[in-house]
Structures are given as C-alpha cells and as structure tokens.
Amino acid sequence: PRSIDVKYIGVKSAYVSYDVQKRTIYLNITNTLNITNNNYYSVEVENITAQVQFAKTVIGKARLNNITHIGPLDMKQIDYTVPTVIAEEMSYMYDFCTLISIKVHNIVLMMQVTVTTTYFGHSEQISQERYQYVDCGRNTTYQLGQSEYLNVLQPQQ
C-alpha cells in the first residue's frame, strides 16, 4: 500500500461567546484537513479525533465517525469543529479577550488531530500537531493557512 497523507491546513473559522458571570469564553473552532489517498483503491476515513490545548491544558475535544471514503488517487478536504471552553484557572484570558481597546485578541492554541483510515480491514492512524493563532475577541473567518503560528519559541508540551 502507498501512503495516505493527512495535511492540517489551518483554522477556517472561530466563533466566540462569553459568560460574564462565569468569566468564561466559548470558542467554536472549525479546522480544515486535506486527506490524500495515494493508493489505487478506495479508503474509508473511519474517524477523526481532535483536541485543542491552551496553556498545556486540553480545552476542547471532538470526534467525528464514519466520515467519508476517498477514491483511488483522490483527495478530500474535510472540515471539523471543536467546541472549546476557556474558564476557571484560565479565566485571566477573559479580560484579554473582551478588552475593547485591542483590535485583534490573538491567542496561541495547539491543535492536535488524529485521522483513522481503513482499507481491506487494515486500520491506519495519522496524527498532526500545529500551533495556531485564534482571535478570541470576535467571530473570525480565516484564509486557509492565515492562522499559522510560526514562532520558534513554542512551549514544551
């Protein structure tokens, strides 16, 4: 079998809401993946599991099942949404994200995704990790790749 390539493209959109009484931020983050099947037979994308981390803490998880199949030598773009909650020990972010004197309230999140594919009863898992900028101050739609965080000073996970 040839490889199945998974490429994390980036954040597509982030929709934000707040709970003043709880000093809590809710971020619905939609991400885009490209999955390429380099084989001469179809493969099933069985599931996608994703999680988002902030300050080394998991703030959101999602799982999609029985997603799609990808034909021979074909590629499919898949969007998946992770609902995240920034609260309690991370509630210092509430002040930053709701501060009206700042135009862009970028925070750095770590996106982790694992894609499970199957073909002829064989299962394969491919994982990706990326740091991304997300604006927690307003609803934002991104150009693909626009939210990539490229700073070499990435925290040790």
């Epitope: 009484q21 709880k22 000093r23 300050a55 080394k56 803490t57 309690e88 020990e89 991370m90 509630s91 210092y92 972010m93 509430y94 002040d95 930053f96 750095v108 700073n151 000073l153 990435q154 925290p155 040790q156």
Partner: antibody
Framework: QVQLQQSGTELARPGASVKVSCKAS????????ITWVKQRGGQGLEWIGE????????YYNEKFKDKATLTADKSSSTAYMELRSLTSEDSAVYFC???????????WGQGTTVTVSS | DIQMTQSPASLSASVGETVTITCRAS??????LAWYQQKQGKTPQLLVY???MLAENVPSRFSGSGSGTQFSLKINSLQPEDFGSYYC?????????FGAGTKLELK
Amino acid sequence: QVQLQQSGTELARPGASVKVSCKASGYIFTTYGITWVKQRGGQGLEWIGEIYPRSDNTYYNEKFKDKATLTADKSSSTAYMELRSLTSEDSAVYFCARSKGSGTGDYWGQGTTVTVSS
Amino acid sequence: DIQMTQSPASLSASVGETVTITCRASENIYIYLAWYQQKQGKTPQLLVYNGKMLAENVPSRFSGSGSGTQFSLKINSLQPEDFGSYYCQHHYGSPPAFGAGTKLELK
C-alpha cells in the same frame, strides 16, 4: 468595594492542623476564584493553589497537595484552607486573594500568620 | 514546572528616576506574566497581568512589556510610595510560579 477578610493568627503544635478562613465581600463570590499564597519570613511568594467556588474545582501546586485542602462555602462567601501535619516549615504568613485565573490575585486578604512551635 | 528568574535582586534609586526590573521565564509563556508590588509588612498588590495590562487603580507610570521568555516592568518618575519589593509571576499553566523578587530601595 472588594474586600477579603482573613482569620487571625494561629499558634499550633507540630503534627496538628489549622484552618484559615477568608471572607469575601463587594463582588459576586462565584464569579472569581480564590487563590492562596505562602510567604515565609518576609521572603518570596509561593503559590499553594486555588478554588473556584461556583464549581468547587480546585487546582493545587503539587508541592502542597498533601499539605493543604481548599474549600469554599458559597452561602457565606467564605473560602477556607486547612493545613495538616504541621511542621516548623509551615510557619509563615498565608494570603488569600481573589483570582483572575491561574493564581493572579487582584485583591488580597491581610494575611494570616501561622506559627508552629512545640 | 516553569521557573522565573528576576533581576536585579536589589536596586537603589532616587525619587524621580526611572527604573526597570526584568524577569526571565525558563520556557515560552507568551504574554502571560503578572507583576506585583509588596511594601514591608503589607499585602501584595497586582500591578500588571497578561504582560502589559495595567490592573485597576494602578498609576500609568507603571508599564509592563515583553513576551515569550523576557519581560520587564518599568517605573517612570519614581514616587516615594513606589519603594518596596516587586515580584513577577507567570500565569501560563500550573503551577503559576513567582520570581524571587526585587527589592527597590531609596538611594
């Protein structure tokens, strides 16, 4: 105005336990956390842990996990820290503070002095 | 755990002078740093959090800057009430550690 009123000086024997209280007023108690900090002999500050009264979720510094227990009573807007198995190393001033998250205290109590002596 | 290194340990200055205190994190903490002032025998007071956000009722002569691993607190035109100890504290993950402190004394 926001105020945090801590209980008075505690004198305890080695091996005993003490419970320090921190009564909050001037804000909605369940909106913020309460963080606890230790200061020995006018030296540096050490974060012990914090509690979020809305959910009763607690976050501890590993170093203090077996030493301190944080609780909160929503009805009286009071947070408590119990220190157990006291030794001379626990003699210090203990502060409570309203937490903006992850130990960032924006309003502080006046401090409670705990002295452990036989 | 993330360690915070503060410098200098002590500093002498006169009223009206401008001073800068620095704080270094052992790893990237982005902008998530707070600064406190503590006067002798008193309770700590939050000055700055999220790197440069001034806390309530803090005079504008105080300013925080930096990101990543290097941060500084600048006090313009020192006033008599500014003398005391200053602590940095990261608030990126647990435990949120403090620096050892800087004692600012009147020259």
